[in-house]
């Protein structure tokens, strides 16, 4: 399965649901389908309140049953470990794949944790993280932020990914804005982050 590198903000904005949850065991194959489901225990919903409506939570995460179908394989045996899951809503169920943004919550930087809880949402539908995978690359729009972690760091897990969000400076311009506590106070984001 080939997955494009994804900035956490892109994962947040492109997902129907973003939750924190624990995996409760091995997957269960769903008869007559090429799908399986993991039982999960949702601890917090970060995005998707509108999509879910009255549902109190999700008990299962659905994924293709084979890696060749881009199925997600959960390797951790630790049932108390909390994961950030960014997934899609399909037929009323949470769906994930091998390409889903799905990481242990404690592996996220404090800035990312904060951004998933409140900051990234300010950029959704307004700003676009534009991946730069080869030089030269240029901004196609003032609403784009050039993501250069892949070429500068050789990885999608770089400084912009860990510490920055692409957020509106004004209605026509998006810029990288630092997620650190010390600087965000001075940024014109109070309204967006409220």
């Amino acid at each position: 399965c080939s997955c494009a590198p994804t900035h956490p903000q892109t994962a947040f904005c492109n997902s129907d649901l973003v939750i924190r949850a624990k995996f409760m065991g091995s997957p269960e194959i769903i008869e007559t389908t090429l799908y399986q489901r993991y039982e999960i225990k949702m601890t917090k919903m970060l995005k998707g309140f509108d999509a879910v409506g009255n549902a109190t939570g999700f008990r299962f995460a659905y994924t293709p049953a084979m890696e060749s179908l881009c199925g997600y394989v959960h390797k951790s045996q630790n049932r108390s470990e909390e994961f950030l899951i960014a997934g899609r809503l399909r037929n009323g169920n949470l769906h994930i794949t091998a390409c889903s943004f799905l990481v242990p919550w404690h592996n996220l930087s404090p800035a990312q944790q904060k951004a998933f809880v409140k900051t990234y949402s300010a950029g959704c539908g307004v700003c676009t993280v534009f991946p730069c995978s080869a030089i030269p690359c240029k901004l196609e729009s003032d609403s784009h932020c050039l993501w250069t972690d892949q070429i500068l760091m050789g990885s999608e897990k770089g400084y912009q990914s860990d510490h920055f969000a692409c957020l509106p400076r004004n209605p026509d311009l998006c810029t990288w804005q630092y997620l650190g506590v010390s600087m965000t106070r001075s940024l014109p984001l109070a309204k967006a982050e409220a």
Epitope: T32, L34, S68, L69, R90
Partner: antibody
Amino acid sequence: QVQLVQSGAEVKKPGSSVKVSCKASGGTFSSYAISWVRQAPGQGLEWMGWINPNSGGTNYAQKFQGRVTMTRDTSISTAYMELSSLRSEDTAVYYCARITYIGYDFWGQGTLVTVSS
Amino acid sequence: DIALTQPASVSGSPGQSITISCTGTSSDVGGYNYVSWYQQHPGKAPKLMIYDVSNRPSGVSNRFSGSKSGNTASLTISGLQAEDEADYYCQSRDLYYVYYVFGGGTKLTVL
């Protein structure tokens, strides 16, 4: 290079059964579901069902339920499709194909099954 | 297991573009972006040309493109070449791989 090699042509009597094999090489057999598709002479492609070699789970098209059985032998990387109660309209080329997230990316060469009295 | 509807035949001259349609329902073509297209030359096994409506597998010419509007998917072949003469089949599936369905097939003739 992935290859799906099917068993040879068969001539069968009406009412009998046929079992077609599909041997995979060049990939991890249990990592890919295998689908069976048939094509009657001069006609289009018709989906019959699939088997998950990992679990042995199957799913059959409604039209073939009760007449088709798909099995596998992981030790020899081979999938099988057995069709029973054969009738003349089952005369067709039967294909196996590997299912991946992009679709049916590799196909067997096809097995001609002729049903004739 | 109702087949998707395709025109029985289409034709075009070398260098031209042609489009083959594939009409289903909101339960198959219209409901998901899981439409594939296959090319089949006489006596040969089908070959995957387009997947997920508009994506090309590696090795497939960029003369082949796919799209979808509502319950109808389309395959467009630009710059027709003699070797494009073949049968073309669309295929759709549901979300959980419970069923697949093929179109009836379209014979493409390059004049």
